[in-house]
Interface confidence: medium
């Protein structure tokens, strides 16, 4: 079996001019392509992998929501030579939240890593964005986490930072087929420079107060201090599945339309996030795809 092969990390790694073919090992009988797009209220980026796969032919599309961070995943496996170029890796430039200028800042600032490399997303070096409230949701928390896509024996990962709806989530995550989006939330401007070691204790839990020992000359204090030994109370996760994005038309004859970009174009969005789901920004492409090797 021969499959297309590429890796895209918020760049043009799977753009037409960089397409490779690879012969699969004996016993490997499916080609795979997986696309994962992450959308914050300040932009979106994607990861994609094509190559020799494992398992059965089929499709698996899913949408996920992690505290207002939206993720769209498409996985496609097929059993014909070079059949794994059916997902359209084109995206339109995202107009965040429909029109970001229509939303006044809510006073919170967060570090933003949207398609940045791990090196560019270290500490306080990423750009700072002003949070705003959209779609009747309050985005006053900052997030620091990672998105990981695994397919075709390849794992690609990128950092994610930005404004979210939760200020206290700790090591929360959502998963899809070969996909994970996880991280922690925090309260306060620019608090998300590094939440990798965030513990489960949050500002919502009163601190344990150590009282001075009672003085022997006084009567024992009647003040009682209650400490909770139960697990930290955190708001219920807003994680929920979303309608799956629709897949692209399989590529066909060369005489048809060309389409490609540095990030996957995914149709549909999160229910309840119409303002920023881009449901109208990722129209299904008219006409079959162009089977060409780009860059030549």
């Amino acid at each position: 079996l021969e499959c297309y092969s590429c890796v895209q990390k918020a760049d043009d790694g799977c753009s037409p001019n960089k397409m490779k073919t690879v012969k699969c090992a004996p016993g490997v009988d499916v080609c795979t392509e997986a696309v994962g797009a992450v959308e914050t209220i300040h932009g979106q980026f994607s990861l994609a992998v094509r190559g020799c796969g494992s398992g059965l032919p089929g499709k698996n599309d899913r949408g996920l929501d992690l505290h207002g961070l939206l993720a769209f995943i498409q996985l496609q496996q097929c059993a014909q030579d070079r059949c794994n170029a059916k997902l359209n890796l084109t995206s339109r430039a995202l107009d965040p939240a429909g029109n970001e200028s229509a939303y006044p800042p809510n006073g919170v600032e967060c570090y933003s890593c949207v398609g940045l490399s791990r090196e560019a997303c270290q500490g306080t070096s990423p750009p700072v964005v002003s949070c705003y409230n959209a779609s009747d949701h309050v985005y006053k928390g900052c997030f620091d986490g990672n998105v990981t896509l695994t397919a075709a024996n390849v794992t690609v990962s990128l950092p994610v930072r930005g404004c979210v709806q939760d200020e206290f989530c700790t090591r929360d995550g959502v998963t899809g087929p070969g996909f994970t989006l996880s991280g922690s939330c925090c309260q306060g401007s620019r608090c998300n420079s590094d939440l990798r070691n965030k513990t489960y204790f949050s500002p919502r839990i009163p601190p344990l107060v150590r009282l001075p020992p009672p003085e022997p000359t006084t009567v024992a204090s009647t003040t009682s201090v209650t400490t909770s030994t139960s697990a930290p109370v955190r708001p219920t996760s807003t994680t929920k599945p979303m309608p799956a994005p629709t897949s692209q038309t399989p590529r066909q004859g060369v005489e048809h339309e060309a389409s490609r970009d540095e990030e996957p174009r995914l149709t549909g969005g999160a229910a309840g996030h119409q303002d920023r789901s881009n449901s109208g920004q990722y129209p299904a492409k008219g006409g079959p795809q162009q089977p060409h090797n780009k860059g030549c």
């Epitope: 073919t21 060309a258 060409h292």
Partner: antibody
Framework: EVQLLESGGGLVQPGGSLRLSCAAS????????MSWVRQAPGKGLEWVSY????????YYADSVKGRFTISRDNSKNTLYLQMNSLRAEDTAVYYC??????????WGQGTLVTVTS | QSVLTQPPSASGTPGQRVTISCSGS?????????VHWYQQLPGTAPKLLIY???QRPSGVPDRFSGSKSGTSASLAISGLRSEDEADYYC???????????FGGGTKLTVL
């Protein structure tokens, strides 16, 4: 039918500037990567630059990097190539080409740029 | 000098089979990048002839075929016709140059 029509070529002195345009029709321009490819008189093809469908990614051949700028206006279905600090070796027919899923599947008829003193 | 190496000329008589080679390196064809072939008739713009190593766009006769092996690719034209007289270019992406590269072109003459 797909059509690509280049314009803007002409005679220019070394060090001068020129802006090429490519008017596209017959396909969804905003979904297509586009390229400029040139061909010096009597010579072979040389890729110059390409731009992603949204315009957010641009790439250049080393020979033109820092001097040429590719851009696009998807609302006008037009691709551009701004050429500055032109040299005699930039003399060529410049083709606008659409990139299909992988290859350059449609080409314009070309516009001649002549750089001479 | 072109990154992809083609013979400058090739010739054949009508009905013959002609093969044009395209030699690359580990940073382009050998890296697994797909190869395309373009035909440029005299005085016209290039036209896509073969894409994705061996695929023909609709409208291209099955007399034209492409193949790829290792760091090389080849274009075969069977049942040669006078209208096949043209320049033929191979192309592929190149890692080291971060862009598409073309062969120097092969001028095919039908005797």
């Amino acid at each position: 039918e797909v059509q690509l029509l280049e314009s803007g070529g002409g005679l220019v002195q070394p060090g001068g500037s020129l802006r090429l345009s490519c008017a596209a029709s017959g396909f969804t321009f905003s979904s297509a990567w586009m390229s400029w490819v040139r061909q010096a008189p009597g010579k072979g093809l040389e890729w110059v630059s390409y731009i992603s469908s949204s315009g957010s990614s641009t790439y250049y051949a080393d020979s033109v990097k820092g001097r040429f700028t590719i851009s696009r206006d998807n609302s006008k279905n037009t691709l551009y190539l701004q050429m500055n600090s032109l040299r005699a070796e930039d003399t060529a027919v410049y083709y606008c080409a659409r990139e299909g899923l992988w290859a350059f599947d449609w080409w314009g008829q070309g516009t001649l740029v002549t750089v001479t003193s | 000098q072109s990154v992809l190496t083609q013979p400058p000329s090739a010739s054949g008589t009508p009905g013959q089979r002609v093969t044009i080679s395209c030699s690359g390196s580990s940073s382009n064809i050998g890296a697994g990048y797909v190869v395309h072939w373009y035909q440029q008739l005299p005085g016209t713009a290039p036209k896509l002839l073969i894409y994705d190593n061996n695929q023909r766009p609709s409208g291209v006769p099955d007399r034209f075929s492409g193949s790829k092996s290792g760091t090389s690719a080849s274009l075969a034209i069977s049942g040669l016709r006078s209208e096949d007289e043209a320049d033929y270019y191979c192309a592929a992406y190149d890692d080291s140059l971060s862009g598409p590269v073309f062969g120097g072109g092969t001028k095919l003459t039908v005797l």
